[in-house]
């Protein structure tokens, strides 16, 4: 049935789906706080622009009785139930914020008309790529893949003089939602990553991973995994590691590496950590006081979703254009807007661009140091520390295949 949008006559509503199944186990109260803080900022910005309009959010909760796994496993049905709820109420905002699970976003996108924009804090999987009215405000798997391929091919850095074409990927099925989809993308045989590599094997058992660390017959020196240092330690412990092994630890939404008092544990010396460049401190903000550093990005994406809507609303109102049109629904891409923490850039497909940072452990200081940055918007690497104090021989990253000469 046709759902009317509460989106005209100076009153603009945002429908926020508050799903029990979420990409990050974040109390819904914290997300509400983030949305409300965003609304305050948007109202101020519209007022400053001389636009005398009302902007509100409607929080839509699911029953929580049926869909209570808390993770993303039953999110498909929960998402569709919430859509049914909207349909029954015959009321929808100008924009839908949420869901964050790839399963639910994919299904909801299929089951809805493309007449309103969807903004997601999550939806990391490749199945949510290239969706005309979907905007994703946390780095999706495609961006990670492009970095990895770029880095694998790079051979002209003082510390990386070999192109790589092989990798192991550790994926045991217990990953968080972001890691699940990142690794899923690397595993997929049809993905860009798989297409560009000559050899790639997925390690699914702890023992497989542990054996590779000292296996003289291994087919690659490079192992990709996803999670934090503690996750790696549980798996690796204090086991010996061959000197030319490189572990790439994907831990995008964790800015603890940049804190002043952090010392890298010894088991991280063979590890390069891929994370996002830290934002300005959000600690003073009312919505982030209760958040752990790893959860800040999730709440921030909700807040930025509100600011993005405010940005687009302002543009359309100033141009005297209608909000309830396909043009509005398709406009949330290929732009830069003022986010809570500075400018936020969306690519041609509505996916957030960011600066990824590759860290290494300095053998001198036992601190995490920035090796290079990667700008997802232009697909370019910039070496930051061209004279790193690596654990690897000659302070250079080894070849990906033992015994192979210069490429």
């Amino acid at each position: 049935s046709q759902v009317s949008q509460n989106c005209h006559n100076g009153s603009y509503e945002i429908s926020v789906l508050m799903m029990g199944n979420s990409a990050f186990a974040e109390p819904l109260k914290n997300l509400e706080d983030a949305v409300n803080e965003g609304l305050e900022i948007v109202r101020g910005r519209l007022q400053n622009a001389g636009l005398n309009v009302t902007v509100n959010a409607t929080f839509m909760y699911s029953d929580g009785l049926i869909h209570n796994s808390g993770d993303c496993r039953s999110s498909t049905c929960e998402g569709l139930d919430l859509l049914r709820k909207i349909s029954n109420a015959q009321r929808m905002g100008c924009v839908l914020i949420g869901p964050s699970c790839t399963y639910s976003t994919f299904q909801m996108y299929l089951d809805t008309e493309l007449s309103y924009p969807m903004i997601s804090a999550g939806s990391f999987g490749l199945s949510c790529d290239y969706k005309e009215t979907l905007t994703r405000l946390m780095s999706p798997a495609r961006k990670l893949m492009y970095f990895l391929v770029n880095f694998w091919k790079t051979n002209d850095l003082p510390f990386k003089t070999y192109s790589w074409s092989t990798s192991y990927v550790y994926k045991n099925g217990t990953e968080t939602e972001d890691c699940f989809w990142y690794l899923n993308a690397l595993e997929a045989s049809v993905s860009y990553f798989s297409h560009e590599l000559g050899f790639k094997v997925v390690l699914r058992q702890d023992k497989e991973f542990q054996d590779i660390l000292m296996d003289h017959n291994r087919k690659s020196n490079v192992i990709i995994m996803c999670g934090g240092p503690e996750f790696l330690y549980k798996l690796k412990g204090d086991r010996a590691v061959a000197e030319d092994i490189v572990i790439i630890l994907v831990d995008l939404f964790n800015d603890q590496y940049f804190e002043d008092n952090v010392t890298a544990p010894d088991y991280m010396k063979n590890v390069l950590v891929l994370t996002l460049s830290p934002g300005n401190s959000l600690l003073n903000s009312s919505f982030s006081r209760n958040l752990s550093p790893t959860k800040r990005d999730f709440a921030l994406a909700y807040l930025n979703g509100i600011l993005l809507f405010g940005h687009m609303l302002k543009i359309f109102l100033e141009n005297g254009e209608n909000i309830t049109t396909p043009k509005f629904a398709h406009a949330f891409r290929n732009l830069t807007f003022e986010g809570y923490d500075g400018p936020v850039t969306l690519d041609d497909w509505g996916d957030v661009d960011s600066t990824m940072v590759l860290l290494y452990t300095s053998v001198d200081t036992k601190k995490y140091k920035v090796l290079l940055t990667y700008d997802t918007h232009v697909n370019k690497t910039y070496p930051v520390d061209m004279s790193p104090t690596f654990t690897w021989k000659n302070s250079k990253l080894p070849n990906d295949i033992t015994g192979r000469g210069p490429q």
Partner: antibody
Framework: EVQLVQPGAEVKKPGSSVKVSCKAS????????ISWVRQAPGQGLEWMGR????????NYAQKFQGRVTITADKSTSTAYMELSSLRSEDTAVYFC???????????WGQGTLVTVSS | QSELTQPASVSGSPGQSITISCTGT?????????VSWYQQHPGKVPKLMIH???HRPSGVSNRFSGSRSGNTASLTISGLQAEDEADYFC??????????FGTGTKVTVL
């Protein structure tokens, strides 16, 4: 396309400090570096140091170590170079430039002439 | 880091080719691919002509080319034109996250 905008000129007394700004317009200070380079009248180019604004990481040429401080404000997309204990030999045009690759500066500010005179 | 050594001046007639050298050490020019060349007209801002030893940025004439042999980098300008008259500087990564420029070469078109 990003442009780097600098103020035209500054006159300073010996022993004082100067802080030159460099604002990115038409874009942001991205994940590349911003280098500061100076050129004394009729002389060559001299690299002073660089900053990666998104991370606040700096490197300085040995010659200027302890006398130069490079900072950046991400929110205003502006980089700054402060040179202290000025002497007459510091009279020069000070350029900021974007490092698109190491030692490869593809976008330059128009330069700020700093004159040190009593 | 000491400056890279360039000839003070090089001249040529229109249509000729000229080469400017830039000599360093194995710790800078010879050790990394990060060697660039800049053109600077009097009173103007330097312009990047070559980066990574031999790569030309878009918009730069293909009359400009770069190369390297050992610790010496070279910039060649073929089909010399009046507008090529300017100062030319090389620069290189010099280890320890530092850069160094050359002494500069004045190119005169006769």
């Amino acid at each position: 396309e990003v442009q780097l905008v600098q103020p035209g000129a500054e006159v300073k007394k010996p022993g004082s400090s100067v802080k030159v700004s460099c604002k990115a317009s038409g874009g942001t200070l991205s994940s590349y570096a911003i280098s500061w380079v100076r050129q004394a009248p009729g002389q060559g180019l001299e690299w002073m140091g660089r900053i990666i604004p998104i991370l606040g990481i700096t490197n300085y040429a040995q010659k200027f170590q302890g006398r130069v401080t490079i900072t950046a404000d991400k929110s205003t997309s502006t980089a700054y170079m402060e040179l202290s204990s000025l002497r007459s030999e510091d009279t020069a045009v000070y350029f900021c430039a974007r490092d698109q690759r190491p030692a490869s500066m593809d976008v330059w500010g128009q330069g700020t002439l700093v004159t040190v005179s009593s | 880091q000491s400056e890279l050594t360039q000839p003070a001046s090089v001249s040529g007639s229109p249509g000729q080719s000229i080469t400017i050298s830039c000599t360093g050490t194995s710790s800078d020019v010879g050790g990394y691919i990060y060697v660039s060349w800049y053109q600077q007209h009097p009173g103007k801002v330097p312009k990047l002509m070559i980066h990574d030893v031999s790569h030309r940025p878009s918009g730069v004439s293909n009359r400009f080319s770069g190369s390297r042999s050992g610790n010496t980098a070279s910039l060649t300008i073929s089909g010399l034109q009046a507008e090529d008259e300017a100062d030319y500087f090389c620069s290189s990564y010099a280890g320890s996250n530092n850069y160094v420029f050359g002494t500069g070469t004045k190119v005169t078109v006769l």
